[in-house]
Interface confidence: low
């Protein structure tokens, strides 16, 4: 159904609509103002003062006809102001003009809210002339009106550089209630207040709002939007809607989950990305963050050996990336690892315990006592020493390296050799007599070699020389020893 | 501005012990962890004692270990070192160092040090 | 322990210099090495974290590199206030510090 709004000759019947000037489509179809009414339309329905010719633009014509008279003032047609129709209806209403002969080229264009509505695809304008004047009528059509075609229309046509201006046409568009604001998902702590916004608008005004709780209405009386529900607290989740009312009907808003903030569900899936002789690089998967974000994560580790004193090292991250590199570890030692998660509530409970080795590392100590000496009788150099602590090998002993350096005048030669790791003792040949050998020792693991032991510097004589003596690792802070035999 | 400031050095026998303190101020104290380092005259760094921003977390070089005691008191900005049968080779400045990391129960770096106190053991 | 050395230990240079110390970790440290400076008297102060981080307030002339074992710091252009002790320092194990580089006017 087209509402169609034209100029004709019936008189204006008073008040036939809602307000003088208006179209209520859905009465009253087709509506019809004389050019000889009191009534003028105008936007927002405020009738102008009786007697008044015209609200638009005028242009007074320069030029006269052969008799010499002025020509009258151009201006449009009186035409219905205000049309109200609901949405998707369809509507068409126009404005027209007679204009003199002499003018050629004129054309109309249609303006909404102050902007030129371009791609006339809605407009059509006829002309009919007669032998002095033509009368154009624009006319202006939507099919399936919507909100947006809510506004002010006018037509404008330029003569002589001057613009005439229509009065405006405002179309109304009812329908439903629309939200413009909507009730949105929240978490909240348990027996906390909180605020919930609904907010809708028309036309037709006034909307009323009532709320609905887990499909309960809350209040009994209907509110103006916009409207704010105060929650008290909860203790349970729920689920919240509005419902919003005008005249054309009703509608509700999308249903919203309140959740209780809780603590979080333990992690999940702790893994071992990479192990080395101090340090385990874990990853976890995070449980259920308990409707609040996490904050921060606890990674607990403890010594799996039964003989530990079973004390625990606890280790605190960010929550994300969920990855963590736990240092300070021993070499070559199992650990039972578990994280847990907090966020504002609380902490959660530790994650499913996983085992986890550390590798061999290259010892952290030297061999100790270490002593060298010659036995002349078969030209050996004899080296013992102690093996490192346990505790300080890192890993499992596969053996020792030792460094034998032979220096004399402008000879200096550096020696390596393997020993087992058994042996406490070795024997190496002697390579240059009349020479200072100095010798350190160091442990090695499938880690790595250990640090070398301070030196240790025996003089080698020439062939024949007289008895011998060993020499030692030195004690703390003494210079390294030389031994000459 | 943060400001760690030593004190409680002195002489003392082998054998003896003695308290060092350090108050902290111009961040807050109770979030990060700390650290003991120690440096011999004329010899290069060593570190002595870690503590968590919480005290469940300590750590204590093997040096060290059996002897010493690090401790905290969050209310009070405060940390402290109970060193007990001191030796000659204590002989040192002791830094308090504060761990670079919030919260986190791992030794990393030391991005602020008070200026020191001496220890000196001799008889 | 995890040992680290430092080369060299002692090192002449003048204003305007580049300047590179090496660190060398007895075993892989990943990124975990901090550098200090320190003058006589004075607190270490922190240089350079994680390998390569600059610490807030550290002028750009210093810079650190490496991974695994070997890490350098430069300085790229000396200046008067350069001259002092420079340490390593490893955090993936117990803390440990190499032996220090002395940085000398020539």
């Known amino acids: 159904a087209i509402t169609e709004a034209r100029e004709e000759a019936k008189p204006y019947p008073l008040f036939p609509g809602p307000f003088p000037g208006s179209l209520q489509t859905d009465h009253t179809p087709l509506l019809s103002l004389p050019h000889a009414s009191g009534y003028q339309p105008a936007l927002m329905f405020s009738p102008t003062q009786p007697g008044r010719p015209h609200t638009g633009n005028v242009a007074i014509p320069q030029v006269t006809s052969v008799e010499s008279k002025p020509l009258p003032p151009l201006a449009f047609k009186h035409t219905v102001g205000h049309i109200i129709l609901s949405e998707h209806k369809g509507v068409k209403f126009n404005c027209s003009i007679s204009v003199p002969n002499i003018y050629q080229d004129t054309t109309i264009s249609w303006w909404k809210d102050g902007k030129e509505l371009l791609g006339a695809h809605h407009a059509i304008t006829q002309f009919y002339p007669d032998d002095e004047v033509t009368a154009i009528i624009a006319s202006f059509s939507i099919t399936s009106v919507q909100r947006s075609d809510n506004g002010s229309y006018i037509c404008k046509m330029k003569i002589n550089n001057e613009e005439i201006v229509s009065d405006p046409i405002y179309i109304e568009v009812q329908g439903l209630p629309h939200f413009t604001k909507q009730p949105e998902s929240m978490n909240v702590t348990r027996n906390t207040a909180f605020n919930l916004t609904c907010q809708a608008v028309g036309p037709p005004e006034p909307v009323n709002i009532f709320w609905v709780q887990n499909s309960s209405r809350v209040n009994e009386q209907p509110e103006k939007s916009p409207s704010v529900l105060t929650v008290p607290g909860l203790t349970e989740m729920a689920v919240f809607s509005c419902e919003a009312h005008n005249d054309k009907g009703l509608t509700v808003s999308k249903g919203v989950q309140i959740n209780i903030k809780a603590i979080p569900s333990p992690p999940t899936e702790v893994s071992i990305r990479n192990s080395t002789a101090h340090s385990i690089l874990i990853s976890w998967v995070p449980g259920f963050d308990g409707y609040s974000p996490f904050r921060n994560c606890s990674i607990q580790v403890k010594e799996a050996d039964p003989l530990s004193n079973g004390s625990v090292m606890i280790f605190n991250t960010s929550a994300l990336p969920h990855l963590y590199q736990i240092k300070q570890l021993q070499a070559l030692a199992n650990y039972s690892i578990g994280v847990s998660c907090m966020n504002e509530i609380g902490w959660s409970a530790v994650s499913p315990w996983i085992l986890a080795s550390t590798t061999e590392g290259a010892p952290s100590v030297a061999p100790l006592n270490v002593t060298v000496f010659l036995n002349e009788s078969s030209d050996n150099v004899d080296i013992r020493w102690m093996k490192p602590p346990t505790k300080q090998q890192d890993g499992e002993l596969v053996g020792y390296r030792i460094s034998h350096v032979w220096q004399s005048a402008g000879i200096s030669k550096e020696l390596l050799e393997e020993v087992g790791q058994n042996g406490s003792r070795a024997r190496i040949s002697v390579q240059v007599h009349n020479a200072t050998c100095t010798v350190r020792i160091a442990a090695v693991t499938r880690g790595g070699v250990g640090p070398f032991s301070d030196p240790v510097k025996i003089f080698i004589p020439a062939h024949g020389w007289v008895d011998y003596a060993p020499s030692s690792t030195p004690a703390p802070g003494n210079a390294d020893p030389v031994l000459i035999i | 501005e943060v400001q760690l400031v030593e004190s409680g050095g002195g002489l003392v026998q082998p054998g003896g012990s003695l308290r060092l303190s350090c108050a902290a101020s111009g961040f807050t104290f109770s979030s990060y962890s700390m650290n003991w380092v120690r440096q011999a005259p004329g010899k290069g760094l060593e570190w002595v004692s870690y503590i968590i921003s919480g005290s469940d977390t300590i750590f204590y070089a093997d040096s060290v270990k059996g002897r010493f005691t690090i401790s905290r008191d969050n209310a009070k900005n405060s940390l402290y070192l109970q060193m007990n049968s001191l030796r000659d080779e204590d002989t040192a400045v002791y830094y308090c160092?504060?761990?670079?990391?919030?919260?986190?129960?791992?030794?990393?770096?030391?991005?602020?040090w008070g200026q020191g106190t001496l220890v000196t053991v001799s008889s | 322990a995890i040992q680290l050395t430092q080369s060299p230990s002692s090192l002449s240079a003048s204003v305007g210099d580049r300047v590179t110390i090496t660190c060398r970790s007895s075993q892989g440290i990943s990124s975990a090495l901090a550098w200090y400076q320190q003058k006589p008297g004075k607190a270490p102060k922190l240089l350079i974290y994680d390998a390569s981080s600059l610490e807030s307030g550290v002028p750009s002339r210093f810079s650190g590199s490496g991974s695994g074992t070997d890490f350098t710091l430069t300085i790229s252009s000396l200046q008067p206030e350069d001259f002092a002790t420079y340490y390593c320092q490893q955090f993936i194990s117990y803390p440990t510090f190499g032996q220090g580089t002395r940085l000398e006017i020539k």
């Open positions: 160092a504060r761990d670079e990391t919030v919260v986190r129960g791992v030794i990393n770096y030391f991005d602020y």
